[in-house]
């Protein structure tokens, strides 16, 4: 049972499982990597271990959820929740990926609209390797940092939006008919 989670650094995170916990379990432990305990609930008490999470985590014994505040990139790891009942254990793994927030993208006009209404735009995030998606009046979503398109004659303004993954920040380029760049 492995769940993947991607979050932005600085945010608060809840690590939990989609299913309900075994009834009347004896012990519940959260691990960071395979050998470091974060917190253990046993005999009605929660014990928080000396770790980089001390003071940043809280366990909800009812749901088994682990709340981590202000996650950092160094918190990237596989977290494991182990539940012990009747001398047998179960494990759930959560692979947490912490990414830095992405700044607002800059849209560069590499080839301006001309009489043929040909347009080439590039969407740039300095020093980041992220996923790009272009939205607008396009035949299909373009998942690339560069948008190239030939526009049909039109009467209304058109906008193309570049969205970068992780923080869902976006930049928009608009122009008005017939084919003049209006704003970006």
């Amino acid at each position: 049972r492995l769940v993947h989670m991607t979050v932005v650094s600085g945010s608060n995170v809840t690590l939990n499982i989609s299913e309900s916990l075994p009834e009347n379990y004896k012990q519940l432990t959260w691990f960071y990597t395979f050998d470091q305990k974060i917190v253990e609930w046993d005999s009605g008490k929660s014990k928080y271990f000396e770790s980089k999470f001390k003071g940043r985590v809280r366990l909800d014994p009812q749901s088994g959820a682990l709340y981590i505040s202000k996650v950092q990139k160094e918190d990237n790891s596989t977290y494991v929740m182990r539940v012990l009942k009747d001398g047998y254990e179960q494990e759930w793994k959560i692979k947490l990926q912490v990414l830095d927030p992405v700044p607002k993208p800059v849209i560069k006009i590499e080839k301006d609209v001309d009489d043929n209404c040909y347009l080439k735009l590039s969407c740039v995030i300095p020093g980041e390797s992220v996923n790009y998606t272009w939205y607008g009046e396009l035949p299909k979503e373009i998942q690339n940092s560069v948008l190239e398109t030939t526009l049909k004659p039109h009467k209304h303004s058109r906008c193309y939006t570049c969205q970068v993954s992780v923080s869902s920040k976006n930049g928009t380029f608009c122009f008005s008919p017939p084919c003049t760049a209006a704003r970006s």
Partner: antibody, heavy 120, light 107 residues
């Protein structure tokens, strides 16, 4: 069925290094941590360290930190234990042992053992 | 590190006897204790885990008990094939540690 097959016996001189391999089969190699336990002649069991084959994360007995190196080759489902700066007290049978759960290092599956003899 | 102290270090008993081996942890390990049997020249074999859960295929004459710092392995009726060295192990906290072993012989 789960099988752990270790490399053959080794004779080494003091100061040398030894690398013991442990080939796993019968289960998904990356889903369980692998550990190394040694046993000197007529002595008890001593845990050396463990490794998560999925990420390469390791945990060592402080006694062996700096001298023991645990690695894995996921493509061949093989775990390795290298021990450097060997001395006569390192003469022992070295076992690889698979944890029953990722976070529960008790050992239901063991390799057959590799005898390492350190002698000048 | 958590020390696991076994007693006795060796014992001799007759076939049919009830045999008890104890293990004391230097600090609370909950129930994260396993017991192993190792016959001469063989690989250790898991008998008990979580202090009292018998591993698959282990005869019912073997039982474990205890929690916190004091643990016991009991063989209710000793059989000739039980001649071996028995080890306790704690897996509550890294580094993992074993007891020094108890060598069991038949009288």
């Amino acid at each position: 069925q789960v099988q752990l097959v270790q490399s053959g016996a080794e004779v080494k001189k003091p100061g040398a290094s030894v690398k013991v391999s442990c080939k796993a089969s019968g289960y998904t190699f990356t889903e369980y941590t692998m550990h190394w336990v040694r046993q000197a002649p007529g002595q008890g069991l001593e845990w050396m360290g463990g490794i998560n084959p999925d990420t390469g994360d390791t945990s060592y007995n402080q006694k062996f930190t700096g001298r023991a190196t645990l690695t894995v080759d996921k493509s061949t489902s093989t775990a390795y234990m290298e021990l450097s700066s060997l001395r006569s007290e390192d003469t022992a049978v070295y076992y690889c042992a698979r944890a029953q759960f990722w976070t529960t290092p008790r050992f239901a599956y063991w390799g057959q053992g590799t005898l390492v003899t350190v002698s000048s | 590190d958590i020390q696991m102290t076994q007693s006795p270090s060796s014992l001799s008993a007759s076939v049919g006897d009830r045999v008890t081996i104890t293990c004391k942890a230097s600090q609370d390990v909950g129930t994260a204790v396993a017991w192993y049997q190792q016959k001469p020249g063989k690989v250790p074999k898991l008998l008990i885990y979580w202090a009292s859960t018998r591993h698959t295929g282990v005869p019912s004459r073997f039982s474990g008990s205890g929690s916190g710092t004091d643990f016991t392995l009991t063989i209710s009726s000793l059989q000739p094939e039980d001649v071996a060295t028995y080890y306790c192990q704690q897996y509550s906290t890294y580094p993992i540690t074993f007891g020094q072993g108890t060598k069991l012989e038949i009288k």
